[in-house]
Interface confidence: low
Amino acid sequence: LQDLCSNCPAGTFCDNNRSQICSPCPPNSFSSAGGQRTCDICRQCKGVFKTRKECSSTSNAECDCISGYHCLGAECSMCEQDCKQGQELTKKGCKDCCFGTFNDQKRGICRPWTNCSLDGKSVLVNGTKERDVVCGPSPADLSPGASSATPPAPAREPGHSPQ
């Protein structure tokens, strides 16, 4: 006997209780492929989530995060609180980057400044909480006429002794 369920299009399900009739998905559910025996419950974008695309009978809802949050995970499965540039998110909320680290985004963690000397270069622009240092040419690259130029001192914050 031919399986009549294979004829059921997306947006319907094969209702075994009704002689394999293709029944439309109930409200707040969907089937994205044909031949389904059940419809999936639509995702609910609530709380920190807001609806980017409404659920339809053939496709799931898609969520974004409300203002002040950003998406994490596949299909925005989580929302994480935004921080300011120069901060990172910890268990206790947004905290300023420690001296010697920076974060130039509203998300993610503070990362160490680039160590210019590892590449044989000098610090051209000091780092801040929000910005990495800018490395300049190595002293050997400087022309004799420019060799008297003093590279900027490493960035230092109040309360920190030079490292």
């Epitope: 409200p27 639509c42 609910q44 609806t51 989580m78």
Partner: antibody, heavy 130, light 111 residues
Framework: EVQLVETGVEVKKPGASVKVSCKAS????????MHWVRQAPGQGLEWMGI????????SYAQKFQGRVTMTRDTSTSTAYMELSSLRSEDTAVYYC???????????????????????WGKGTMVTVSS | QSALTQPASVSGSPGQSITISCTGT?????????VSWYQQRPGKAPKLIIY???TRPSGVSNRFSGSKSGTTASLTISGLQAEDEADYYC??????????FGGGTKLTVLG
């Protein structure tokens, strides 16, 4: 005792702004979302918006977008609702109401308000009249 | 976002049961199990009596019960008492990350 204490009566002229405060006590202020709801004389309840006192993020009813600003001061456990460009139809009692849900998780961000308003302030009567 | 639809008034005699309906759409009442009911007496702030469609907060009489079918939620008050006379409001979460209230229902206890 868990309670929300709002400012008293406010009388404003059309075009002005009003800032209503709501001081929370008896619970951890940053652990519960706060809603603002208003009620015009003889009329029903109208949801205005919600603020997460932990991060300060907000979501406003479309009707009030651009006119309402919800803020909070965690040091005093106080939520604020400011409504600008007042008109006579803004005459109403303005309530702050705590959301029943608890337990914001910074790592997942998956804290969702329940939408049940379990603790209400007594309301601030705002009259807009020329 | 339109207000949820409630009857303007209902009435009943002491001891009777009454039901107040709250009709929305698939974007609010029909789409979520986040329907709440509030009792408001004159000059007072609203009081939560039902949330999550059927759940009663502690301290609320078991004479109050909630249910939902499709896009309509209902509040039933059994064994009606004079003190139940008040305005009743439903509210629901919506797919726009907002909440919406019903227009309110005035309950009159006869006799």
């Amino acid at each position: 005792e868990v309670q929300l204490v709002e400012t008293g009566v406010e009388v404003k002229k059309p075009g002005a702004s009003v800032k209503v405060s709501c001081k929370a006590s008896g619970y951890t202020f940053t652990s519960y979302y706060m809603h603002w709801v208003r009620q015009a004389p003889g009329q029903g309840l109208e949801w205005m918006g919600i603020i997460n006192p932990s991060g300060g993020s907000t979501s406003y009813a479309q009707k009030f977008q651009g006119r309402v600003t919800m803020t909070r001061d965690t040091s005093t456990s106080t939520a604020y609702m400011e409504l600008s460009s007042l008109r006579s139809e803004d005459t109403a009692v303005y309530y702050c109401a705590r959301d029943l849900g608890e337990g914001y998780d910074f790592w997942s961000g998956y804290y969702t308000p329940s939408g049940a308003f379990d603790i209400w302030g007594k309301g601030t009567m705002v009259t807009v009249s020329s | 976002q339109s207000a949820l639809t409630q009857p303007a008034s209902v009435s009943g005699s002491p001891g009777q049961s009454i039901t107040i309906s709250c009709t929305g759409t698939s974007s609010d009442v029909g789409g979520y199990n986040y329907v709440s009911w509030y009792q408001q007496r004159p000059g007072k702030a609203p009081k939560l009596i039902i949330y999550d469609v059927t759940t009663r907060p502690s301290g609320v009489s078991n004479r109050f019960s909630g249910s939902k079918s499709g896009t309509t939620a209902s509040l039933t008050i059994s064994g009606l008492q004079a003190e139940d006379e008040a305005d009743y409001y439903c509210s629901s979460y919506t797919s726009y990350s907002t909440w919406v209230f019903g227009g309110g229902t005035k309950l009159t206890v006869l006799g």
